[in-house]
Amino acid sequence: KESCDVQLYIKRQSYHSIFAGDPFKLECPVKYCAHRPQVTWCKLNGTTCVKLEGRHTSWKQEKNLSFFILHFEPVLPSDNGSYRCSANFLSAIIESHSTTLYVTDVKSASERPSKDEMASRPWLLYS
């Protein structure tokens, strides 16, 4: 899909299985042409997406894409949930699909499950 609109490359119904206590970077890949748009992260609360204020964010530049990164330092059990990034471009708001963090609280897990186990059974990971 080639165009000069801003595009946010988060896959629909994507997810990440992560552990409380670990660091994690949630990336929002952003494609733009001339001027980098203002990008923000929000966390879904029901149907409302609540803007995340005062969080550590950064930009990473690659060849054809920029990444707006939300840092979790470290991941907390309360970080479980769905997140969306949005870009302000020419006074329009472009929203990404939401992506879900499934946080396993290692204190309550008897042992750390393997990535394969987590990947195939995300419904076990709700905290």
Partner: antibody
């Protein structure tokens, strides 16, 4: 143009396992979801599960959990379906398909792989 | 699981005449992003399925505009305004909103 090449027909013994492959061209599979569908002779379509090749995360229909394992190798742009403990119920055509994970702009199916289970 | 129910099972149509297939889901397919992930596939005899329509009404590239998809929530329809010989095969609706993905049982379109 996005295309999928599936591996050839398989004749397997009951109780054995089989691994099918599906190689994509015309797209980087990291930008897609790849999924597998079962079709028994003269019957409808059953969704087995899908993989996000960018991170290896999978979703399965619970009825295929433990029977099917989907993996992907981004270096060869290939997805795999492994079926274990085969019985006559697993004899079917297995289709792989690929779709754009961001915009749903394409959804392309392979030609299918026939799995026959016989002693 | 979402149950997808198609009707009729078989449709016998004269070339040049219209055809209509119904697809009903047991739950709403409206996603939280405001879109409805309902697709239509055609499986021609001896071939693999091919997507015709996605997001209820969007035609895939190369699909003739005699095909139209419509509906919302739980009720969907595929219409062919003038059936051609190449349209014969089995039509499936399937939903991409909820896991696991589920297919309708199929509607076989025969040419009279």
């Amino acid at each position: 143009e996005v295309q999928l090449q599936q591996s050839g027909a398989e004749l397997v013994k009951p109780g054995a396992s089989v691994k099918l492959s599906c190689t994509a061209s015309g797209v980087n599979i990291k930008d897609t979801y790849m999924y597998w569908v079962k079709q028994r002779p003269e019957q409808g379509l059953e969704w087995i599960g899908r993989i996000d090749p960018a991170n290896g995360y999978t979703r399965y229909d619970p009825k295929f959990q433990g029977k099917a394992t989907i993996t992907a190798d981004t270096s060869s742009n290939t997805a795999h379906l492994q079926l274990s403990s085969l019985t006559s119920e697993d004899a079917a055509v297995y289709y792989c398909a690929v779709y754009d994970g961001y915009y749903e702009s394409f959804d392309v199916w392979g030609a299918g792989t026939t799995v026959t289970v016989s002693s | 699981d979402v149950v997808m129910t198609q009707a009729p099972l078989t449709l016998s149509v004269t070339i040049g005449q219209p055809a209509s297939i119904s697809c009903k889901s047991s739950q709403s397919l409206l996603d939280s992003d405001g879109k409805t992930y309902l697709n239509w596939l055609l499986q021609r005899p001896g071939q693999s399925p091919k997507r015709l329509i996605y997001l209820v009404s969007k035609l895939d590239s190369g699909v003739p505009d005699r095909f139209t998809g419509s509906g919302s929530g739980t009720d969907f329809t595929l219409k062919i305004n003038r059936v051609e010989a190449e349209d014969l095969g089995v039509y499936y609706c399937w939903q991409g909103t909820l896991f696991p993905r589920t297919f309708g049982g199929g509607t076989k379109l025969e040419i009279k």
